[in-house]
Interface confidence: low
């Protein structure tokens, strides 16, 4: 079934919604609003200034932090550009990808993609879990995904960016730091930017348990970033989810596993990478529809339109997108151990249900969704699942 | 050490509700994702519901969707399962599962049992 | 929802020998961005909670013995254990962690021959 566009009100409040790091079914609607999660299995993010609450949360705040506006592909103003997606090669965007500026213009419900434009992207398997944003906020990652942000010292009363699963995108103040050290790979239905379930606020400096490289973008589930616990979440894209090697033994034993399990990406990962995961040989390209999230503060313009490589996987990608000053991270990055990570290698799940997530510079990270199986997927991050045509 | 103890759990008839708790100890509880696992007798392990380690995000499975609802307190290192419209098919051991940025479930509580029957 | 086949339903080895179980996923659950299967494997020991044993498809859990591998990609995945010990009678269940909902293979009963 050819992609829809999402033209309805309550498809642009999707898209606001978000899903956090764990994706639910996209028939589940977060009890709680939350920004979308980040990672799908297993990583969730805060928006800006906002708490982490897991890896759906975290892919919120990523997304908070690239923009409130979202773009897709097919809207005019980014002609020719090239996104990378999720996978690391490098996307040619349709030339119908509008701008930041324009988008926000428009009404928040961005356009369905041609299909034609889905073949830019890599294909993505299935959604097998379903997510459905709350009301309230976006989430991270179904299921994509539960990925654990929060630090050693959470900050429960910070902002929750929903993972894996479902859960709104409320707007929040962007920063030029966000710091991720673990996602919550779940996503969640309460709150939609529960995106790793990040304990701290963006920029604060908590310790952050090291897990075993096992923040999946659920995705699956986002629980860490809204279940998230699937993901994202993710529910968790970090190298390790944990700074400190000393606050317990259980985070000890996690951050022996995140060191064993190497980069950035493994462990913050959404626990549940909704949708992330690739698709096999032979899998046919599902058709898709492009979301993207602008930074907020580039939302004005679109300079130069020109995408911002992401590092292939297993290649550091700090300072891709560090500034010169090393306090600032470009559009569709986050502050993560110190340097800048794109939001895609953090949260595999930052797009939900196989949507790919791919990078355009000043405008952020944006998802390319998937129609397929008679199931059509829609939202900012993918996260909204229609079967209804 | 790392420990979840779960509790509330008992007979209830069909139509009830049940609140079941899980006391978490070892770790930094509002770091982590939490889950609810069931496995009714004989059977086979059903994700049920997570959590983001900030309490922000839920996820439901849809067998139980509109009817359960995840909550933790982090002040209590307590996540709760909160069971309404309870069913036969409901009946389970639940357990509590800490979960891990990748969405595994690294640590496991010693479950409790939940008999809905008439 | 992503369906997690395990077979065979049960199996029986002798003391020693080398045990294999088989996971499948109707989707793939390798996310291409950190090329990551999310695929876990439990043991259940009966009146026991289950026991992570291997995470992203082939990353032993802390503490678990050597003799349990995994290995697969996409939708394919198997669980190995080396050289069955009596303690390792138990039941195995693969899940996929990578979207929600997460899901379990039916399970798979390892026995002593």
């Known amino acids: 079934v050819p992609a829809r566009e999402a033209g309805s009100a309550v498809e642009a409040e999707e898209l606001v919604k978000g899903s956090p790091a764990w994706e639910p079914p996209a028939n589940d609607t977060r009890e709680e609003a939350g920004p979308p999660a980040a990672g799908e299995d297993e990583a969730s993010w805060t928006a800006p200034g906002g708490e982490l609450a897991g890896p759906e949360e975290v892919l919120q705040e990523s997304a908070a932090v690239t923009g409130t506006a979202w773009l897709e592909a097919d809207s005019p103003g980014l002609g020719g550009v090239t996104a990378e997606a999720g996978s690391g090669d490098a996307q040619a965007l349709p030339a119908t990808l509008q701008a930041p500026h324009e988008v926000l213009g428009q009404s928040i419900m961005p356009p369905a993609i041609p299909e034609a434009t889905e073949a830019s992207g890599p294909p993505s398997p299935t959604p097998g879990d379903k997510l459905s944003p709350a009301s309230e906020l976006p989430k991270e990652s179904p299921l994509e995904v539960w990925l654990n942000l929060g630090g050693s010292t959470p900050d429960p009363q910070g902002p929750e960016l929903t993972y894996p699963f479902q859960g709104t995108l409320e707007p929040q103040p962007a920063s030029d730091i966000i710091d991720i050290d673990y996602f919550e790979g779940l996503d969640g239905e309460g709150r939609g930017a529960d995106l790793g379930s990040f304990p701290g606020s963006p920029g604060t400096s908590e310790n952050h348990p090291d897990t075993e490289g096992e923040t999946p973008s659920w995705s699956l589930l986002d629980l860490y970033d809204d279940f998230t616990p699937f993901d994202e979440s993710d529910f968790y894209p970090t190298t390790s989810f944990y700074d400190d090697l000393d606050e317990e033994e259980e985070e000890e034993e996690d951050d022996k596993d995140a060191v064993g399990g190497g980069d950035l990406e493994d462990e913050n990962e959404l626990l549940v990478p909704t949708g992330k995961p690739g698709l096999g040989p032979g899998t046919g390209q599902p058709t898709s529809r492009w979301h993207a999230v602008p930074p907020q503060h580039t939302l004005g313009s679109v300079p130069g339109s020109s995408i911002a490589l992401r590092p292939r996987p297993g290649e550091p990608g700090r300072d891709l997108a560090s500034s010169e000053n090393g306090t600032e991270c470009r559009s569709g990055f986050v502050r993560h151990n110190g340097s800048c990570r794109s939001v895609c290698d953090l949260f595999p799940s930052y797009c939900h249900n196989g949507g790919q997530c791919y990078l355009v510079e000043n405008i952020g990270a944006f998802c390319r969704c998937n129609t397929q199986d008679y199931i059509w997927h829609k939202g900012m991050r993918c996260e909204s699942i229609i079967t209804d045509f | 050490e790392v420990q979840l103890l779960e509790s509330g759990g008992g007979l209830v008839q069909p139509g009830g509700s049940l609140r079941l708790s899980c006391a978490a100890s070892?770790?930094?509880?509002?770091?982590?994702?939490m889950s609810w696992v069931r496995q009714a007798p004989g059977k086979g392990l059903e994700w049920v519901s997570a959590?983001?380690?900030?309490?922000?995000?839920?996820y439901y499975a849809d067998s139980v969707k509109g009817r359960f609802t995840i909550s933790r307190d982090n002040s209590k290192n307590t996540l709760y399962l909160q069971m309404n419209s309870l069913r036969a098919e409901d009946t389970a051991v639940y357990y509590c599962?800490?979960?891990?940025?990748?969405?595994?479930?690294?640590?496991w509580g010693q479950g409790t049992l939940v008999t809905v029957s008439s | 929802d992503i369906v997690m086949t395990q077979s065979p339903d049960s199996l029986a080895v002798s003391l020693g020998e080398r045990a294999t179980i088989n996971c499948k996923s109707s989707?793939?659950?390798?996310?291409?961005?950190?090329?990551?299967?999310?695929l876990a494997w439990y043991q259940q020991k009966p009146g026991q909670p289950p026991k992570l044993l291997i995470y992203?498809?082939?990353t032993r859990e802390s503490g678990v013995p050597d003799r349990f591998s995994g290995s697969g990609s996409g939708t394919d995945f198997t669980l190995t254990i080396s050289s069955l010990q009596a303690e390792d009678v138990a039941v195995y269940y693969c899940?996929?962690?990578?979207?929600?909902?997460?899901?379990f293979g039916q399970g798979t009963k390892v026995e002593i021959k």
């Open positions: 899940q996929q962690t990578a979207t929600q909902p997460l899901t």
């Open positions: 992203w498809a082939s």
């Open positions: 959590i983001s380690g900030s309490g922000g995000s839920t």
């Open positions: 989707q793939s659950v390798l996310y291409s961005s950190n090329n990551k299967n999310y």
């Open positions: 070892g770790f930094t509880f509002s770091s982590y994702a």
């Open positions: 599962a800490k979960t891990k940025p990748n969405n595994a479930f690294d640590y």
